[in-house]
Interface confidence: medium
């Protein structure tokens, strides 16, 4: 319990002008009503339009965040970085605004975005090659007869750098799951200029075909199921288009490399899940007893036969009947859909049990959280101490340490007049944050409160992410308070896993003014 201290302040000017300050354009966000008109794609129509580009970027396979990685992979003594090319989704055909991934898609890693459609839908992919060499967009589902009508020769599927091509096809019944199978079925899309080189360079993504009326019109996905696509493969950087460039980057002169040296070859092979090795893939976070669907993919040569195991859990495969399994053998080019009802909260591992693959790092962790584990993290009780609460600035004596739910006194909240302000809480260790309770404050006859805000979070205090949650836009805007005393409880679904959490007011009355409590759970509990 916080002691109620009444802090004296100098005479402050009273601002009776009850204006609302707007600091961001409304169209930047999806305010979380289910208004499909705000979506970058309209899922109501039967044509589902995706804007996807091939984009080059540096990738380290998660080595910089893994405590296990042997630094001898890097000739230069630091974590090596490899140029890759990935499928990146954009908001529209101008290809200027990337659609950054939120918490629900973070697990895709190196993979391209989900392409989802139902039987009888049309899929339209506008593909732009922003890379430095020719690539293509290809799926075995694309009907090249239709493609030929647009004047393209079948299988001459190159798109030169800085060129754009539109692919259009109808989802046929044979591509969909049967009535006995799960609601959606996994396929893949990739580039097939040189299939092996293109995939080793990074171009692959999940394509989901679903039964009719499965996908929520507003969100473009099945909201009753949480989906995770996992691509198990051995990325061989010697087979990448960027091999020479990467070798020069990661091997400082004088660099004496014997191409046939087995150690050298092994240092350029990564036993990865979605492009991450050794338990570093982020985003595998799910609620206990929630229906989880895993799309398991493998590509490559025969060494890419994987034996997939989820520790502590069994999963279900559905063909004509439903089978409970603990292990799934995945073959290259075969994509499998399994479901799970995780009953045990905790941190678990998904791994390939083939000895060499497991030893080389083909595993990652998934977190199953309990929705029952939601308690106040200590803003009101005082468990969160003053030094843990900081802000971009403050108005007079309305300091960040006063931003505690139900705090009383004449000055009893954090307040600021600055535009683009923020308040930050350091929880000292990563926590699961399920929600936030907010409250405004009074000053004489004025009601001060934050009516809308966004949330940012971080594990290290350096790399920040904007919370997107279920929003189909680039971020989630939360509705806050409408008066000085009421409490608004906003839920984070999915929850946030972070050590630092930062609230950014976007709309407010008179001044951004806040008392709050964070609801959550110790990550270890």
């Amino acid at each position: 319990e916080i002691t109620r201290t009444t802090l004296q302040s100098d005479q402050e000017e009273i601002d009776y002008d009850d204006t609302i300050s707007v600091e961001m354009k409304k169209e930047d966000f999806d305010i979380y009503d289910e208004d499909e008109n705000q979506s970058p794609r309209s899922f109501q129509k039967k044509t589902r339009h995706y804007f996807i580009a091939a984009v080059e970027r540096l990738w380290d396979y998660g080595m910089s965040s893994s405590p296990h990685v042997l630094r001898n992979r890097a000739q230069s003594g630091s974590v090596p970085q490899f140029k890759k090319v990935v499928f990146q989704e954009f908001t529209d055909g101008s290809f200027t605004q990337p659609l950054y991934r939120g918490e629900l898609n973070e697990h895709l890693g190196l993979l391209g975005p989900y392409i989802r459609a139902e039987v009888e839908d049309n899929i339209m992919v506008t593909f732009r090659n922003q890379a430095s060499r020719p690539y293509s967009f290809y799926s075995s589902l694309i009907s090249y007869e239709e493609d030929q009508r647009q004047g393209a020769e079948p299988r001459k599927n190159f798109v030169k750098p800085n060129e754009t091509k539109t692919y259009f096809w109808k989802v046929q019944h044979h591509m969909a799951p049967t009535k006995d199978e799960f609601d959606c079925k996994a396929w893949a899309y990739f580039s097939d200029v040189d299939l092996e080189k293109d995939v080793h360079s990074g171009l692959i993504g999940p394509l989901l075909v679903c039964h009719t009326n499965t996908l929520n019109p507003a969100h473009g996905r099945q909201v009753t199921v949480q989906e995770f696509a996992l691509f198990f493969t051995i990325f061989d950087e010697t087979k990448s288009w960027y091999f020479t460039e990467n070798m020069e980057r990661n091997c400082r002169a004088p660099c004496n490399i014997q191409m046939e040296d087995p150690t050298f070859k092994e240092n350029y092979r990564f036993h990865a899940i979605n492009g991450y090795i050794m338990d570093t893939l982020p985003g595998l976070v799910m609620a206990q007893d929630q229906r989880i669907r895993w799309y398991l993919l493998s590509m490559g040569s025969n060494e890419n036969i994987h034996s997939i195991h989820f520790s502590g859990h069994v999963f279900t495969v559905r063909k004509k009947e439903e089978y409970k399994m603990a292990l799934y053998n995945l073959y290259p080019g075969v994509f499998e859909t399994v479901e799970m009802l995780p009953s045990k909260a905790g941190i678990w591992r998904v791994e390939c049990l083939i000895g060499e693959h497991l030893h080389a790092g083909m595993s990652t962790l998934f977190l199953v959280y309990s929705n029952k584990c939601q308690t106040p993290l200590g803003m009101a009780s005082g468990h969160i101490r003053d030094f843990q609460i900081t802000a971009s600035g403050q108005y007079g004596q309305w300091a960040p340490k006063l931003a505690r739910l139900h705090y009383s006194g004449s000055i009893n909240a954090w307040s600021t007049k600055e535009p683009f302000s923020w308040i930050k809480v350091d929880l000292l260790a990563p926590m699961i944050i399920h929600g936030i309770k907010t409250q405004g404050a009074r000053q004489k006859f004025s009601s001060l409160y934050i009516s809308q805000f966004i949330i940012m979070y971080s594990l290290d205090g350096k790399k920040w992410q904007t919370y997107r949650g279920n929003s189909t836009g680039t971020l989630m805007v939360f509705f806050g308070n409408v008066d000085s005393s009421g409490i608004k409880h906003n839920i984070f679904n999915p929850p946030i896993i972070a050590r630092y959490i930062r609230l950014h007011p976007t709309h407010y009355s008179i001044r951004s003014t806040l008392r709050m409590e964070l609801m959550g759970c110790d990550l270890n509990s």
């Epitope: 916080i2 002691t3 009780s381 005082g382 003053d386 260790a429 990563p430 990550l523």
Partner: antibody, heavy 126, light 108 residues
Framework: QVQLLQSAADVKKPGASVKVSCTAS????????IDWVRQATGQGLEWMGW????????GFAQKFKGRLTLTRDTSTSTAYMELRRLESEDTAVYYC???????????????????WGQGTLVTVSS | EIVLTQSPGTLSLSPGERATLSCRAS???????LGWYQQKPGQAPRLLIY???SRATGIPDRFSGSGSGTDFTLTISRLEPEDFAVYYC?????????FGGGTKLEIK
């Protein structure tokens, strides 16, 4: 060097209140929390609560809620612990401790009590 | 609240020997939030280890801490005569902060 000097031993009757002082020197008093911990004779340590000398904010263990008050006087760099409605079970040595938030030093670790007062024995007896 | 159980209650060893003290938590504790204290008769506790394994200022390197989750260990590699005292573990991650019951390290 950092020093925390506590008030002398005190004897109180059940139902009374006791106020223990803790005067800090050798550092900036308002920059560190003060925690209070007690220890009954021959027993282990029991955390009571914390107080921020800068803001006056405090947090308590549920057990002491309603009868524990933590205050401070920044002009004399002194923290106070007042415990009301004393019972014989409150007989103990009461310690104040400077709580160092290691996150200040960049290590990102939470506060631990790195400097302690010498302790004040409070005896509750009729 | 989190209950910390220390074992053994009493440990009898000779100077020069290695001491291993255990602290078990009733639920998982982040290693960032576990400390160890030493207390001699008539004295206030003294911080030895914070964050499960970081030595506090001025603490000799014969003291080391380890562990994670629910099991933590304080090790004194070579006992000196001044090391015989009572040792407490403390968790300071979940309110209320709690201490273990203590391990008395005595001369054999």
């Amino acid at each position: 060097q950092v020093q925390l000097l506590q008030s002398a031993a005190d004897v109180k009757k059940p139902g009374a209140s006791v106020k223990v002082s803790c005067t800090a020197s050798g550092y900036i008093f308002t920059s560190y929390d003060i925690d209070w911990v007690r220890q009954a004779t021959g027993q282990g340590l029991e955390w009571m609560g914390w107080m921020n000398p800068n803001s006056g904010n405090a947090g308590f263990a549920q057990k002491f809620k309603g009868r524990l008050t933590l205050t401070r006087d920044t002009s004399t760099s002194t923290a106070y612990m007042e415990l009301r409605r004393l019972e014989s079970e409150d007989t103990a040595v009461y310690y104040c401790a400077r709580s160092t938030p290691h996150s200040y030093s960049g290590s990102g670790l939470p506060p631990t009590s790195d400097s302690w007062g010498q302790g004040t024995l409070v005896t509750v007896s009729s | 609240e989190i209950v910390l159980t220390q074992s053994p209650g009493t440990l009898s060893l000779s100077p020069g020997e290695r001491a291993t003290l255990s602290c078990r938590a009733s639920q998982s504790v982040s290693s960032s939030f576990l400390g160890w204290y030493q207390q001699k008769p008539g004295q206030a506790p003294r911080l030895l280890i914070y964050g499960a394994s970081s030595r506090a200022t001025g603490i000799p390197d014969r003291f080391s801490g380890s562990g994670s989750g629910t099991d933590f260990t304080l090790t004194i590699s070579r006992l000196e005569p001044e090391d015989f005292a009572v040792y407490y573990c403390q968790q300071y991650g979940i309110s209320p902060l709690t201490f273990g019951g203590g391990t008395k390290l005595e001369i054999k």
